[in-house]
Amino acid sequence: MSSKYPRSVRRCLPLCALTLEAALILLFYFFTHYDASLEDQKGLVASYQVGQDLTVMAALGLGFLTSNFRRHSWSSVAFNLFMLALGVQWAILLDGFLSQFPPGKVVITLFSIRLATMSAMSVLISAGAVLGKVNLAQLVVMVLVEVTALGTLRMVISNIFNTDYHMNLRHFYVFAAYFGLTVAWCLPKPLPKGTEDNDQRATIPSLSAMLGALFLWMFWPSVNSALLRSPIQRKNAMFNTYYALAVSVVTAISGSSLAHPQRKISMTYVHSAVLAGGVAVGTSCHLIPSPWLAMVLGLVAGLISIGGAKCLPVCCNRVLGIHHISVMHSIFSLLGLLGEITYIVLLVLHTVWNGNGMIGFQVLLSIGELSLAIVIALTSGLLTGLLLNLKIWKAPHVAKYFDDQVFWKFPHLAVGF
């Protein structure tokens, strides 16, 4: 069976991708250089390990997490890697240009690589809502637009609210979730009869998705502490994330069983809910003063994600007309908000305890930042969605959603693949 991937796209995609890569190489040649001030070899290794954790999370964790569609597992893993590789390159340049005025040479440090990996990870989270419905050319556009939008959001927030440019990555869960949902909302919706089969989750892909969830689970403390400089805050972030994740696993497995009429555990619910605690504490992990608070947050997050896993896909389908978004993705949007609300509450408590009269102002700033993040996510997501609907991308026909055969060469096509 020959590929149904339009020939025009198959011809121009490699050329376009290589041209884009050549352009990036030129930009790196003219505008970047390596950091001169980092020296100590032990420190280099310690810093690199954090970056390595992020890469494992992005490539393996998010790659396998989205591989739970029976006929779309190859594309999920490989397209994720492609987006990560492209996103990291563009993010390093963009962060370098946006974080310094006037723009000079971009200094590449281990920190800037971590920062870029996290920016690229936001694209991978968003892509969870559209993987299977778009081709590689469309994903390239999505990477470039979303990384640019996230960078712009951070620059706008740092200028308006006078905060550190790096700090604004704390909105990246919420940004990624709402960006992805908006893009998915713009894509062609109705699925013809007969293609439901492609969307069915089979045992093996669900196991690989669980493997992805495990990678994310193991390394989530790294993502929540990766950018923090203060040793105390970094320690708090790691410990709090660890405890929140631990509790959300217990909640996920027991809650999944509780939600089923026959008290059976759903793998689909579990592999998304086990990560709930990590997302929920992401924004405020450096602020949480005690493990019990992180654990309570993990519990609440686990319950929300089990509830969300049952209701959100139906809600997204019926109300918003968004079909077949991954459960994990729909949960990100809820838990990201929970995390932001927790941050604001903790900020209030901190300022009350320390007798600071600036509570109202701090809360107002935080709400303003969050609102701006959601607004920019929705507008840039809408723009991207409209852009991806253009005919030039030769998007896969709805009948070919979630189908690896459209994109991949198979050595021998086994019946029932």
Partner: antibody, heavy 128, light 107 residues
Amino acid sequence: EVQLLESGPGLLKPSETLSLTCAVSGAPISNYWWSWIRQSPGKGLEWIGEIDGSIYTTYYNPSLKSRVAISKDTSKNRLSLKLTSVTAADTAVYYCAREGQNPLVPTYGSTGFGLDFWGHGLAVTVSS
Amino acid sequence: AAELTQSPSSLSASVGDRVTITCQASQGISSWLAWYQQKPGKAPKLLIYKASSLQSGVPSRFSGSGSGTDFTLTISSLQSEDFATYYCQQYSSSPRTFGQGTKVEIK
């Protein structure tokens, strides 16, 4: 109250290695970043470098990078500075200092809150 | 590296005067700037961090402002104990850099 006390030789000959230690009391070094700064006679302040108290990350002033090494001993709660091949230009008062932090405001990358606690300083003279 | 230029390099003022010292960065440093006071034979003392936040224990007559490249330290009513040298320091990138200092003398 946090206290920092620098110690080491006050007089060195050119080409020798300067070795200073900074004993910290009142705060575990693993919870903070720590800096070394020097001030030449009648001159301004010059940042030498800094170390993360919890991992081994160090940043140095590029003008001194080839000659300087900052290290820490968590068990003894103290910091060290080594400066090789000293010349008369290295004559200065050497300070160690702690970087402040604010629990409400996270810091990232190189950003920080200034040096909130300083040692009294140690005068070092390089002369033949 | 961001270079810091302080002005004036020295100034004479009387007790009760309002004194303003400026610090200009060669590139944008957001709000990552600290101000220090140093008296002869003593270690510097942190007055202001993050451009405008007053360090605990520092009198409220000291205030800081600015963002990006232009920063100001203001002493609203100069006291006798405020005669010293003042330094700004950027905390945006490595290497950290200090301004050359502003000496505040008695008129």
